[in-house]
Interface confidence: medium
């Protein structure tokens, strides 16, 4: 912590500018007005302050705003955001999507840091739900964001937000997460026609129950094997050979290559050999 010392004559900073890089730590503490710093935060990033000088500037902001920074300051933190601890961020009330974007921009290209995770948590909790615009923004910066949420957190995602989800956003989701997301997707896309509906719902099908898979098998959807392999085993087991054949269409031949892997393996063991033989793939039950 920097000691409180009087500012030397003529060194009081009239504005935040490059001349301050020549100030010692104690001079910055004594000669830079915290309120001035807060109003001119947008200048800080373009001045080559040393890490130690930035520590002093952060300390001044912390003293000025012990209950947490106002959004007007947060929005202009730039890479000083990287110096904030999760504890600092928990004091913030970030409501503007523009502020969120500005700070995510700082961390862009890097894995999600504890600071970013805390910021997102605060923002989403403040909004009460994960609305479409927020989800759009978060998945643009972190494609794996959705799958990092617990099933409980996912339950606050309104069906309308599902329109913002891209297939790659679900790549790392486990079955428990898809169980929560699938009914929302089904609701969101319910007014679409058959082929369009399947394109949209496909990446959520890892949460689909048996009856929905049976219904899809009646719609000539030609599900690919990659999607089939992600279906819930308990949802696949009750399907008949005829239903799986209709569900997969021309992709049914791919079952042979996957016969040793779940859910195909378990499904094969549940079928009568006579029925499997109708596929002509040499599958052994």
């Amino acid at each position: 912590e920097v000691e409180k010392t009087a500012c030397p004559s003529g060194k009081k900073a009239p504005e935040i500018d490059e001349s301050l890089i020549f100030y010692k730590k104690w001079e910055l503490e004594a000669c830079v007005d915290a309120a001035l710093l807060a109003t001119q935060m947008d200048r800080v990033n373009a001045i080559p302050f040393t890490y130690e000088q930035l520590d002093v500037l952060k300390h001044k902001l912390d003293e000025l705003y012990p209950q947490g920074y106002p959004e007007s300051v947060i929005q202009h933190l730039g890479y000083l955001f990287l110096k904030m601890s999760p504890e600092d961020i928990r004091k913030w009330n970030v409501t503007s999507l523009e502020t969120l974007k500005a700070l995510l921009e700082v961390n862009k290209g890097h894995e999600m840091s504890p600071q970013v995770a805390t910021l997102i948590d605060r923002f989403v909790k403040g909004r009460g739900q994960l609305d479409k615009d927020t989800l759009d923004t978060l998945t643009a910066f972190y494609p794996g964001y959705l799958c990092s949420l617990s099933p409980e957190e996912l339950s606050s995602v309104p069906p309308s937000s599902i329109w913002a989800v891209r297939p790659q956003d679900l790549d790392t989701c486990d079955p428990r997460q898809l169980d929560v997301l699938y009914p929302k997707a089904r609701l969101a896309f319910q007014n679409m026609n058959g082929s369009e509906y399947f394109v949209k719902i496909q990446s959520f099908l890892g949460g689909a129950p048996t009856e929905d898979l049976k219904a899809l098998s009646q719609q000539n959807v030609s599900m690919d094997l990659a999607t089939f392999m992600k279906l819930r085993t308990d949802a696949v087991l009750p399907l008949t050979v005829a239903e799986v054949q209709k569900l997969l269409g021309p992709h049914v031949e791919g079952l042979k290559a996957e016969e040793r892997h779940r859910p195909v393996r378990d499904w094969i063991l549940r079928q009568r050999q006579d029925d499997l033989d109708t596929l002509g793939l040499g599958l052994q039950g």
């Epitope: 890490y51 730039g78 921009e105 700082v106 840091s113």
Partner: antibody
Framework: QVQLQQPGAELVKPGASVKLSCKAS????????MHWVKQRPGQGLEWIGM????????NYNEKFKSKATLTVDKSSSTAYMQLSSLTSEDSAVYYC?????????WGTGTTVTVSS | QIVLTQSPAIMSASPGEKVTMTCSAS?????MYWYQQKPGSSPRLLIY???NLASGVPVRFSGSGSGTSYSLTISRMEAEDAATYYC?????????FGAGTKLELK
């Protein structure tokens, strides 16, 4: 992911100048200071200076002030370093890098050889 | 400018052995940063703010120190740790690096 692309090598004659490039991708180019670092064969690392792509502000190591000039082209997310009046002492690998608290990204380096 | 002196200049260690190298600053600094560099590769950040591990760095690496005296420790040497290690300060300009400690596998 964040990447800094640099050409592999430059062969230049004594007394000439060379302009090294560093193309950035995977992050917002205008946010971070871009640093340049020199490494002579078998030697340690020397900091040359840094430039802020958005403002064009620079901060040089006094030792390199008359040797290096840092610039950026925001439209192509590319940083440049011009080295002038080259001598054999300038033969080295030159790295561009982002150096920040908990992360760093370095270019692969450009090997400059000064030879007649 | 702040001069950083690293010692030893060269050292060797056997797999599983504990390794400690030091970095002494000519005047006090608040933080030290440590980089690892292997032949033909760019440097890589290991430790930031004196003691924090950068992303993806194995937990066998640790940093400590304050003022003018800092150190980097590898709790159990592994073959892949053979490299040159540099300390770096950003307390005042120009940024400076130590001359490096070359760690060889015994």
């Amino acid at each position: 992911q964040v990447q800094l692309q640099q050409p592999g090598a430059e062969l230049v004659k004594p007394g000439a100048s060379v302009k090294l490039s560093c193309k950035a991708s995977g992050y917002t180019f205008t946010i971070y200071w871009m640093h340049w670092v020199k490494q002579r064969p078998g030697q340690g690392l020397e900091w040359i200076g840094m430039i802020h792509p958005n403002s064009g502000n620079t901060n040089y190591n006094e030792k390199f002030k008359s040797k290096a000039t840092l610039t950026v082209d925001k439209s192509s997310s590319t940083a440049y370093m011009q080295l002038s009046s080259l001598t054999s002492e300038d033969s080295a690998v030159y790295y561009c890098s982002l150096i920040h608290w908990y992360f760093d990204v370095w270019g692969t380096g450009t090997t400059v050889t000064v030879s007649s | 400018q702040i001069v950083l002196t690293q010692s030893p200049a060269i050292m060797s260690a056997s797999p599983g052995e504990k390794v400690t190298m030091t970095c002494s600053a000519s005047s006090s600094v608040s933080y030290m940063y440590w980089y690892q560099q292997k032949p033909g590769s760019s440097p890589r950040l290991l430790i930031y703010d004196t003691s924090n591990l950068a992303s993806g760095v194995p937990v066998r690496f640790s940093g400590s120190g304050s003022g003018t005296s800092y150190s980097l420790t590898i709790s159990r040497m592994e073959a892949e740790d053979a490299a040159t290690y540099y300390c770096q300060q950003w307390s005042s300009y120009p940024l400076t690096f130590g001359a490096g400690t070359k760690l060889e596998l015994k």
